[in-house]
């Protein structure tokens, strides 16, 4: 049973509005119809789940309403966007992909994308 390869960019810089996007691509060993994608964050010797979505191939990813993640899928690629990021959210964001159905179950975990978030400088008060 070969480990499923998951590829993601090494580094991404969040926008000044605190939005970061990256592609998570997986090499599917079979014809999966149900896929689960989870974004993990590793920082300060702790791993936490940022968001997760299960989708049927060909359909949109559906994250929970209060999720900071959105995404779209195209074949074996998932385009992930994380919003509301601040400097304290800088860390390694890891893409975990599970092929849920049909059996057999496959799991792949990427090497992670280091997302750097820089809080914007507050605008100086203007006299005008």
């Amino acid at each position: 049973c070969k480990a499923m390869h998951v590829a993601q960019p090494a580094v991404v810089l969040a926008s000044s509005r605190g939005i970061a996007s990256f592609v998570c691509e997986y090499a599917s060993p079979g014809k999966a119809t149900e896929v689960r994608v989870t974004v993990l964050r590793q920082a300060d010797s702790q791993v936490t789940e940022v968001c997760a979505a299960t989708y049927m191939m060909g359909n949109e990813l559906t994250f929970l309403d209060d999720s900071i993640c959105t995404g779209t899928s195209s074949g074996n690629q998932v385009n992930l966007t994380i919003q509301g990021l601040r400097a304290m959210d800088t860390g390694l964001y890891i893409c975990k992909v599970e092929l849920m159905y049909p059996p057999p179950y496959y799991l792949g975990i990427g090497n992670g994308t280091q997302i750097y978030v820089i809080d914007p400088e507050p605008c100086p008060d203007s006299d005008f």
Epitope: C1, K2, A3, M4, V6, T38, L40, Q42, S45, Q46, V47, T48, E49, K96, E98, L107, G108, I109, G110, N111, G112
Partner: nanobody
């Protein structure tokens, strides 16, 4: 499909020894293998891991007392536990993760179970004083 089946465990007096075994099938040699433990109301913690090149890592709480090893011929993972203490009492789980990159750091990382998607059924270890 990776499958893990544990054996071993049981009850022992403090200072005693136990060996846990975990037979792995469908296992691919780029996996990270490890042992976790969990007590009621607490999260699973990584006790020991072994990488594809045979390099091992241990949680500080078991260093010098526990030894993880993998027998390639038998496709079996072992955890030799010596000088057991009452605080080692827990449910022990054998696990496999698909990315060795996270192997060595797992023992010092909270939430490291996220990296290990394949789990055995668990075996109880009870150490009495």
């Amino acid at each position: 499909q990776v499958q893990l089946v544990e054996s071993g465990g049981g009850s022992v007096q403090a200072g005693g020894s136990l060996r846990l075994s975990c037979a792995a099938s469908g296992y691919y040699n780029r996996y990270c293998l490890g042992w976790f433990r969990q007590t009621p109301g607490k999260e699973r913690e990584a006790v020991a891991t072994i990488d594809t090149d045979g390099s091992t890592s241990y949680a500080d709480s078991v260093k010098g007392r526990f030894t993880i090893s993998f027998d390639n011929a038998k496709n079996t993972l072992y955890l030799q536990m010596n000088s057991l203490k009452p605080e080692d009492t827990a449910m022990y789980y054998c696990a496999a993760g698909p990315n060795p990159r996270y192997c060595s750091g797992a023992v010092n990382t909270r939430g490291a179970e996220h990296y290990f998607g394949y789990w055995a059924q668990g075996t109880q270890v009870t150490v009495s004083s």
